[in-house]
Interface confidence: medium
């Protein structure tokens, strides 16, 4: 029994199951499931059987390869699929493939939850904030990763003059993608708060930017 | 010798529950389903539903659903069936079988349970 | 549900007899069947999968056959250690269900 194959996919996207190996030659029947219970189609005796399921309409399959295509795949779909084979023989055999159906990662928006000088040293806490997702977080500084163990969904770190970085990066990322977004200080650590602008990412080409005045006055005039 | 160990008898009072365990020895349940199927005293052989230890899912026979539960322990590769609001109808010998799919080859040796005031 | 309905309900017969037991499902079940030897106190034994296929271990005297509503369980020599009572069970759909039984009595 066994034959388990995991795959993750990005959510509206077109699925093919399919095995690795070549079918029993001249099986008697296949038939595809979904979950335990329900049959999604049959193929018997020359003939494809597609059930009443809410894959009716989306789905097809190929008896030559024993492939199941699934079009247009929603986080709903999330499920093992079986495929169950009887041979000419009488035996019977199944295979299962675990799907994972993930929506894309949405655009992060960064926060700056706070940011003090402190002798020549800048301590900076910034959190990354998306809709409740099961991601990764990477950091970085000016476009160089910080170290492993702050990845997390808040960057708290002290900064010295020698390491300040402009611009910080958040990306989040799951198994099918993954997004940026980038806040930048201006000067390093000493903002005014009434003097901070947010500019939309599409004032700046998909990236979101804290600016101070001057740099909004600048950006206009290029 | 793959075998499925079950635990021993239980008596119980009309509205108490059960817990029967299931433990695989020879094996663990990695990729397995285990199903639990009852029989009467002097009755046939009734399925009652299905887990699989490797994913999560189960499914119930309509009849004894909202008062069934099918849980496992991965690490001792132990199935639990827990039945509850016990009739005296639920008394029975009730077995897990398995390794298979789509047939039972392998059964426990069955848990009787009786249900009495 | 996908009812079966098994007969005879019992059998009695000699050591040697041709034994016969038939189940009858109440929709097409393809090859989906399973037949189960019970004797009294111990759990049942699988006999024959998927219609005609004799399960490892089991006497070849053991044989099915049949698809889609009509299946047969044939002993082809009855021994004394055949007796116990007899299930089929369609192994299509969920929930999965069992014939009532057939009680095969040795004379």
């Known amino acids: 029994q066994g034959h388990l194959v995991h795959m993750t996919v990005v959510s509206g996207s077109n699925v093919t199951l399919n095995i690795s190996e070549s079918l029993p030659e001249n099986y008697k029947q296949l038939t595809w499931f979904y979950t335990f219970d329900q049959k999604i189609v049959e193929w018997d005796s020359r003939k494809s059987k597609y059930f009443e399921s809410k894959f009716k309409g989306r789905v097809r399959l190929d008896p030559q390869s024993g492939a199941l295509y699934i079009s247009k795949v929603q986080k709903e779909d999330n499920s093992t699929y079986i495929m169950r084979v009887l041979k000419k023989t009488g035996n019977e055999q199944e295979w299962k493939i675990k799907l994972q159906v993930l929506d894309p990662v949405p655009k992060p928006v960064i926060k700056i939850e706070k940011i003090e000088d402190m002798d020549d040293n800048c301590y900076l806490k910034l959190s990354c904030v998306i809709p409740g997702e099961s991601v990764n977080y990477t950091w970085y500084g000016d476009k160089r990763p910080f170290p492993k163990e702050l990845q997390n969904s808040v960057l708290e770190t002290t900064l010295m003059p020698h390491n300040y970085s402009r611009c910080y990066t958040c990306q989040v990322s799951n198994s099918v993608s993954s997004k940026n977004g980038t806040v930048c200080l201006s000067p390093p650590c000493t903002l005014a708060r009434s003097e901070q602008k947010l500019i939309s990412e599409e004032d700046l080409g998909g990236e979101q930017k804290l600016i101070s005045e001057e740099d909004l006055h600048h950006h206009h005039h290029h | 010798q793959v075998q499925l160990v079950q635990s021993g008898a239980e008596v119980k009072k009309p509205g108490a529950s059960v817990k029967v365990s299931c433990k695989a020895s020879?094996?663990?349940?990695?990729?397995?389903?285990i199903h639990w199927v009852r029989q009467a005293p002097g009755q046939g052989l009734e399925w009652m539903g299905i887990?699989?230890?490797?994913?999560?899912?189960?499914r119930y026979a309509q009849k004894f659903q909202g008062r069934i539960s099918m849980t496992w322990d991965t690490s001792t590769s132990t199935v639990f069936m827990e039945l509850s609001s016990l009739k005296s109808e639920d008394t029975a010998v009730y077995y897990c079988?398995?390794?298979?799919?789509?047939?039972?080859?392998?059964w426990g040796r069955g848990t009787p349970v009786t249900v009495s005031s | 549900d996908i009812q079966m309905t098994q007969s005879p309900s019992s059998v009695s017969a000699s050591v040697g007899d041709r034994v016969t037991i038939t189940c009858r499902a109440s929709?097409?079940?393809?090859?989906?069947l399973a037949w189960y030897q019970q004797k009294p106190g111990k759990a049942p034994n699988l006999l024959i999968f998927?219609?005609?296929s004799l399960q490892s271990g089991v006497p070849s005297r053991f044989s099915g056959s049949g698809s889609g509503t009509d299946f047969t369980l044939t002993i082809s020599s009855l021994q004394p250690e055949d007796f116990g009572t007899y299930y089929c069970?369609?192994?299509?759909?969920?929930?999965?269900?069992f014939g009532q039984g057939t009680k095969v009595e040795i004379n």
């Open positions: 998927a219609a005609s």
């Open positions: 887990t699989n230890p490797n994913d999560g899912n189960t």
């Open positions: 069970q369609q192994t299509d759909n969920f929930p999965r269900t």
């Open positions: 929709q097409d079940i393809s090859s989906w």
């Open positions: 079988a398995g390794l298979r799919y789509w047939f039972f080859d392998l």
């Open positions: 020879g094996h663990t349940f990695t990729n397995y389903y």
